[in-house]
């Protein structure tokens, strides 16, 4: 299996944005790559977002996706937006080298994203 590296822990910003790098050790000369972000929480795995891109080009997520990203060589910089405390969990980067054959699959160990909801601003009386 292809090796995929990602950071162990990331803290989301107060605006609910978390960014991390997913890096894969490409054993072949892929031209088309698919990146999928999976969330594992309470032994349940769900797909957060996915994008297919041509090497050297931008990642294209669906319009309603909470993810954005850029690619550079064998690195993908992923950003997940709109996170809330309940979204805290392990976010796994899955990379597939689709074309040309052969197919390679790599799954990272996951990045634990901690999301802390901001404290509401206290009402002020002037």
């Amino acid at each position: 299996a292809m090796h995929v590296a990602q950071p162990a822990v990331v803290l989301a910003s107060s605006r609910g944005i978390a960014s991390f790098v997913c890096e894969y050790a490409s054993p072949g000369k892929a031209t088309e790559v698919r990146v999928t972000v999976l969330r594992q929480a309470d032994s349940q795995v769900t797909e957060v977002c996915a994008a297919t891109y041509m090497m050297g080009n931008e990642l294209t997520f669906l319009d309603d996706s909470i993810c954005t990203g850029t690619s550079s060589g064998n690195q993908v910089n992923l950003t997940i937006q709109g996170l809330r405390a309940m979204d805290t969990g392990l976010y796994i980067c899955k990379v597939e080298l689709m074309y040309p054959p052969p197919y390679y699959l790599g799954i990272g160990n996951g990045t634990q994203i901690y999301v802390i909801d901001p404290e509401p601003c206290p009402d002020s009386d002037f």
Partner: antibody
């Protein structure tokens, strides 16, 4: 139910052109790579061309490179094969097939016959 | 290109017989070996992918095995509806290539 229906085949003179079409239904077309495979009379199967789901990747058999062009219109659930400079040896039944598993073709159409003859 | 050699090119067996078809690749194709069935005058159907995985709706009497360069398609108990030509195909490298086919008939 997955359905693939080819059309556009016919009799053409050497050096002529044809455009084959494949209408897909019963699945989300834009999620799948698609291929054209041909079968000459009484012969085996020969892969012709492949296009990935978003048309990022396109590949051809060596003998077809430069003469054939595979394309797709995901909005119309359609696959195409533009064939130029046709030769007698291009005479075959042309099948469109879905690449539902990496590098395997899991559903095939009934085929459309192309005859190149003077 | 990777050459795929199938044998035998044709065979005749009785209903209930165990039938074996072999496919040899000219180089290692890992697990990217698929088997297809084409009944007379009909289209092509995927039977087995990744050496041994049955495609949906395929009867369990069909099975696949092998590794590297040598692969086998087995019909454990031949049925009249299995009369067809069977093709192997490699998906390891482009161009994707097929075996020459094995025509299976009933005695």
């Amino acid at each position: 139910e997955v359905q693939l229906v080819e059309s556009g085949g016919g009799l053409v003179k050497p050096g002529g052109s044809l455009r084959l079409s494949c209408a897909a239904s019963g699945f989300t077309f834009s999620d799948y790579g698609m291929a054209w495979v041909r079968q000459a009379p009484g012969k085996g199967l020969e892969w012709v061309a492949f296009i990935s789901n978003l048309a990022y990747s396109v590949y051809y058999a060596d003998t077809e490179t430069g003469r054939f062009t595979i394309s797709r219109d995901n909005a119309k659930n359609s696959l195409y094969l533009q064939m130029n400079s046709l030769r007698a040896e291009d005479t075959a039944v042309y099948y469109c097939a879905r690449s539902g598993l990496p590098y395997a073709m899991d559903y095939w159409g009934q085929g459309t016959t192309v005859t190149v003859s003077s | 290109d990777i050459q795929m050699t199938q044998s035998p090119s044709s065979l005749s067996a009785s209903v209930g017989d165990r039938v074996t078809i072999t496919c040899r690749a000219s180089q290692d194709i890992s697990n990217y070996l698929n088997w297809y069935q084409q009944k007379p005058g009909k289209t092509v159907k995927l039977l087995i992918y990744y050496i041994s995985r049955l495609h949906s709706g395929v009867p369990s009497r069909f099975s696949g095995s092998g590794s590297g360069t040598d692969f086998t398609l087995t019909i454990s108990s031949l049925q009249p509806e299995d009369v067809a030509t069977y093709f192997c195909q490699q998906g390891r490298m482009l161009p994707w290539t097929f075996g020459g086919g094995t025509k299976v008939e009933i005695k």
